[in-house]
């Protein structure tokens, strides 16, 4: 069964900078990836970025840079302009779509105990979708 993992990390040098890493574990090719925060895509979450494997990326503030790391994983850099660092308590969700086979989504957040600069362990929250 395909799975999606989500990893959130705070940058050591800039505490207002976060990076979300997402990956797809499974067969098949990915046709589109959407990243949202505050909840799953289409269910109360706010879109941060959409990535197409061949045709580019689209992103919205506070997303700073969305890019492919491998054919099945992406990263999204975020700039937190607020002093209260709301990202630290935010859920980030990634949805990997393989049209028309199906889509798989998972969510994760920065563990409250994680130290700046250390990679937070993956905290996937599988969301079953019957596409």
């Amino acid at each position: 069964t395909p799975e999606v993992w989500v990893q959130v990390q705070m940058e050591a040098t800039e505490l207002s900078s976060f990076t979300v890493h997402c990956g797809f574990l499974g067969p098949g090719s990915i046709s589109l990836v959407t990243v949202s925060w505050g909840g799953p895509d289409g269910a109360g979450g706010t879109k941060l970025a959409v990535l197409h494997p061949e045709l580019g990326t689209r992103q919205w503030a506070p997303a700073r840079q969305a890019r492919w790391e491998t054919q099945s994983s992406i990263s999204l850099a975020l700039e937190d302009s607020g002093a209260s660092s709301p990202f630290a308590n935010t859920t980030f969700c990634c949805k990997f779509a393989s049209f028309p086979e199906g889509s798989w989504e998972s969510c994760g957040s920065l563990p409250p105990s994680s130290d700046p600069g250390l990679s937070a362990p993956p905290t996937p929250v599988p969301i079953l979708r019957a596409d």
């Epitope: 895509d41 289409g42 959409v50 197409h52 045709l55 689209r58 779509a97 049209f99």
Partner: nanobody
């Protein structure tokens, strides 16, 4: 929960017509395009057969121009595809999808289960 449900498929003779419908429910639409895509038996997925973006711009595949018409009813949260002068090569599973525009084409983010269209005498 996102749900896009297609209907209206079936068996039709060459030269006949069909109207496909797609009803969206529980859908928080945040993309910028919707459209119809198809996959013929034993073949790969076609680029959008007919797509429409949020500005109302419509795009058709060359193979269906002049025969297919896409439309939408925002009040009913529905998308339609009127298919006329159907040919055997139009036989496929048709998917209703919502997504994002990249490079001038609509890339699906959400889609339905598909409806079978068979053109045969």
């Amino acid at each position: 929960e996102v749900q896009l449900v297609e209907s209206g498929g079936g068996l039709v003779q060459p030269g006949g017509s069909l109207r496909l419908s797609c009803a969206a429910s529980g859908y928080s639409y945040s993309g910028d395009c919707m459209g119809w895509f198809r996959q013929a038996p034993g073949k790969g997925l076609d680029e959008g057969v007919a797509t429409i973006d949020n500005a109302g711009r419509i795009k058709y595949a060359d193979s269906v121009k002049g025969r297919f018409t896409i439309s939408r009813d925002n009040a009913k949260n529905s998308l339609y595809l009127q298919m006329n002068s159907l040919r055997a090569e139009d036989t496929a599973v048709y998917y209703c999808a919502a997504g994002w525009t990249f490079g001038g084409q609509c890339s699906p983010a959400d889609w339905g289960q598909g409806t079978q269209v068979t053109v045969s005498s």
